[in-house]
């Protein structure tokens, strides 16, 4: 009976070409980096690079590696215990109600607003009313309402005197 | 998000063979496995077949292993099953699904879709 070896524990070298490494389950449950066989007899690893599994299962199948889209940049590659991180290029933010695909961060606050928080990989800028301090709702405002420096160039937070 | 339409059913013959094909729409079906459920005429839902997300791994339930075959072309988008030596308590209305993967139980795991059906009738 093989051991429970996962394919991330193997030399980079024996990655090339991914055995399939077997061992039996516990309980009916295969560990991390793993999947169930057919039969429920084996517990199968999971392809190095391809697709992963996280927890203890008995799961048919590993789960497909996510791929990072353009726009995005990868943080950490996919392992046979770990899906791969990808995050929203600079500039750019993913928001909770659309995860699907990074927008471009606001460049700039609508008249009357100043800036308090800067673009993040999942946040926009966070403007504020000069004098109440309530937060903007987040939508994208009109060109001609974004305050500016100079025409054409977004303020900078310090040019706004508050 | 995906949507998946079955298509295939029939009126066959015992002894005879069909092809079910189910159509999925949106991007993401290559992020998917993809399986078969059947459910007959007053009884609960059957976990028959599912294929991984490559196509490179396959499930059958005892009742239609070595008859019926489960495959995909992720250039089509599409889930297919052939059944050959049908049988009458092969009847059901069959539905495709995807999810993240199935369990042996057949528990789709994660975000999982499903279609509409197709009534496969095995009668003489």
């Known amino acids: 009976e093989s051991a429970l070896i996962t394919q991330q524990d193997l030399a980079p070298q024996q990655r090339a070409a991914p055995q399939q490494k077997r061992s039996s389950p516990s309980e009916g449950l295969c560990p991390p980096g793993h999947h169930i066989s057919e039969d429920g007899r084996d517990c199968i690893s999971c392809k190095y690079g391809q697709d992963y599994s996280t927890h203890w299962n008995d799961l048919l199948f590993c789960l497909r590696c996510t791929r990072c889209d353009s726009g995005e940049v990868e943080l950490s590659p996919c392992t046979t215990t770990r899906n791969t991180v990808c995050q929203c290029e600079e500039g750019t933010f993913r928001e909770e109600d659309s995860p699907e695909m990074c927008r471009k961060c606001r460049t700039g606050c609508p008249r009357g607003m100043v800036k308090v928080g800067d673009c993040t990989p999942w946040s926009d800028i966070e403007c504020v009313h000069k004098e109440s301090g309530t937060k903007h709702s987040g939508e994208v405002p009109a060109v001609e309402e974004t305050v500016t420096s100079s025409p054409g160039t977004p303020a900078s937070p310090c040019s706004l005197s508050g | 998000e995906v949507q998946l339409l079955e298509s295939g059913g029939g009126l066959v013959q015992p002894g005879g063979s069909l092809r079910l094909s189910c159509a999925a729409s949106?991007?993401?079906?290559?992020?998917?496995?993809m399986s078969w459920f059947r459910q007959a005429p007053g009884k609960g839902l059957e976990f028959v077949s599912a294929?991984?997300?490559?196509?490179?791994?396959?499930y059958y339930a005892d009742s239609v292993k070595g008859r019926f075959t489960i495959s995909r072309d992720n250039s089509k988008n599409t889930l297919y099953l052939q059944m050959n030596s049908l049988r009458a308590e092969d009847t059901a209305v069959y539905y495709c699904?995807?999810?993240?993967?199935?369990?042996?139980?057949?528990?789709?795991?994660?975000?999982?879709?499903w279609g509409q059906g197709t009534l496969v009738t095995v009668s003489s």
């Open positions: 949106g991007r993401t079906f290559t992020n998917y496995a």
């Open positions: 699904a995807s999810a993240e993967s199935f369990s042996r139980g057949g528990l789709p795991y994660g975000m999982n879709y």
């Open positions: 294929i991984n997300w490559s196509g490179d791994s396959t």
